[in-house]
Interface confidence: medium
């Protein structure tokens, strides 16, 4: 009976032990596709995350030649009405000009002396630019980048003056420190007697007969408003 | 003596951001603009962004633009350059450089700091 | 954007030759250009600004040319300390552009 009951329990043992090999491989075959499902699933995941970054930089992009697009068609509407009417009164910008704040800017991209970037402004019904807020000195700024760049400022025939008009002494003003200083150590002969934003935006005098950049602006008539979409 | 030191090298995953910093001295940190520009491994130098920390008013290269942010903590003389969603070809010597200017001529950078390795790999 | 073609690409040369490299650019850009030199595993070293003016503590071998849209850097007679890597840059407005460089080699 003894022997018996040993026999009954190798078999048992034989019986679990091929239960718990049985159990593990169908454990590890579980994990395995587990594995695999999870692998399948971040894959999946990053490919979703992917196109759907990819939409959304083409919704932007498409959104903002939507906006190109009825801003240009706005323009040339508005060109069209001028050309119709009378032209006495500038009810919007000029192609290829930026409207901000009911005036009109363009943005040169090449170098002339001071006297003929006021000159060209003048020939385009403009004037060199007159800034009169530090809000208006931000949009120039944004617009021209860190180079020297002419505005509508200049001691030519004594004090101060802008092209306008607008009166300098009550005026915004931002100069970089020590500035304006006329100075006359270039060897270029006599002082400096032309404004200028300088990389940082500053302000500085220097000698008119330098090349730099320009910005014309231009006043939209008070009364207009923005004409309707065709 | 005009100084930028840079931070030290680093090793990042792909999709990740870098910060590399420049400490400047010597010198009015506010009075001069900061640029950066990198080089690939044999590659040239290329232009990426250019802060002016009196004002924060910053520059980007077209190229970089909403991957890399230039910032500048006056209290420490010190400028960054972050650049996100880091992949292979971001690999290279990140430069910091002081722009230096005289009225009525152009612009320079004058001086530079030693460089920062960035290493992009899986 | 600005193009910048600098040429040569490489020169090789001996010590005391006249050594030139030109920087053509896509617009005028007066004279907003500058070089630099570079040695392996180091930053670049202002040479030249406002395109023809001597950076500080550079030797007088070195000088600059030009003005538009073309540049050049001469090495009057080079030295051994010359054989290094050369860039031109301009500032002519964002991006302040590289030439692509010029590699100065011992002949």
């Known amino acids: 009976q003894n022997s018996q009951l040993q026999e009954e329990l190798r078999g048992l043992r034989e019986t679990f032990s091929n239960f718990t090999a049985s159990t593990e491989a169908q454990v590890k075959g579980l994990s395995t596709q587990g594995g695999n499902v999870g692998r399948k699933m971040k894959s999946l995941e990053s490919q979703l995350e992917k196109q759907q970054k990819d939409l959304s930089e083409d919704h932007s992009s498409l959104l903002l030649h939507v906006k190109q697009f009825v801003s240009d068609l706005r323009s040339l509407s508005c060109q069209m009405a001028a050309l119709q009417g009378n032209g006495s009164e500038r009810t919007c910008c000029p192609v290829n000009w930026v409207e901000h704040e009911r005036s009109c800017y363009w943005f040169s991209r090449s170098g002339k002396a001071w006297a003929d970037a006021d000159n060209y402004c003048r020939l385009e019904d403009a004037h060199l630019v007159v800034v009169t807020s530090w809000e208006e000195q931000k949009f120039v700024q944004h617009h021209i980048g860190p180079v020297n760049t002419w505005m509508g400022l200049h001691d030519q025939n004594g004090p101060w003056k802008w092209v306008d008009g607008t009166d300098y002494e009550t005026g915004f003003k931002n100069w970089r420190p020590e500035q304006p200083d006329d100075w006359y150590g270039h060897g270029l002969g006599g002082g400096e007697d032309c404004a200028h934003f300088t990389d940082d935006g500053r302000w500085n005098d220097d000698v008119c007969q330098r090349p730099y950049r320009w910005v014309c602006e231009t006043e939209l008539d008070k009364a207009s408003q923005e004409p309707p979409l065709l | 003596e005009v100084q930028l030191v840079q931070s030290g090298a680093e090793v990042k995953k792909p999709g990740s951001s870098v910060k590399v910093s420049c400490k400047a001295s010597g010198y009015t940190f506010t009075a001069y603009g900061i640029n950066w520009v990198r080089q690939a491994p044999g590659q040239g130098l290329e232009w990426m962004g250019e802060i002016f920390p009196r004002s924060d008013a910053t520059f980007y290269a077209q190229k970089f633009q909403g991957r890399v942010t230039i910032t500048a903590d006056k209290s420490t003389s010190t400028a960054y350059m972050e650049l996100s969603s880091l992949r292979s070809e971001d690999t290279a010597v990140y430069y910091c450089?002081?722009?230096?200017?005289?009225?009525?001529?152009?612009?320079?950078?004058?001086?530079w700091g030693q460089g920062t390795t960035v290493t992009v790999s899986s | 954007d600005i193009q910048m073609t600098q040429s040569p690409s490489s020169l090789s040369a001996s010590v005391g030759d006249r050594v030139t490299i030109t920087c053509r650019i896509s617009e005028n850009i007066y004279s907003n250009l500058a070089w630099y030199q570079q040695k392996p595993g180091k930053a670049p070293k202002l040479l030249i600004y406002?395109?023809?003016n001597l950076a500080e503590g550079v030797p007088s071998r070195f000088s600059g040319s030009g003005s538009g849209t073309d540049f050049t850097l001469t090495i009057s007679s080079l030295q051994p300390e010359d054989f290094a890597t050369y860039y031109c840059q301009h500032f002519w407005g964002t991006p302040f552009t590289f030439g692509q460089g010029t590699k100065l080699e011992i002949k």
């Open positions: 450089a002081r722009k230096g200017r005289e009225y009525g001529t152009s612009h320079y950078f004058d001086y």
């Open positions: 406002a395109a023809i």
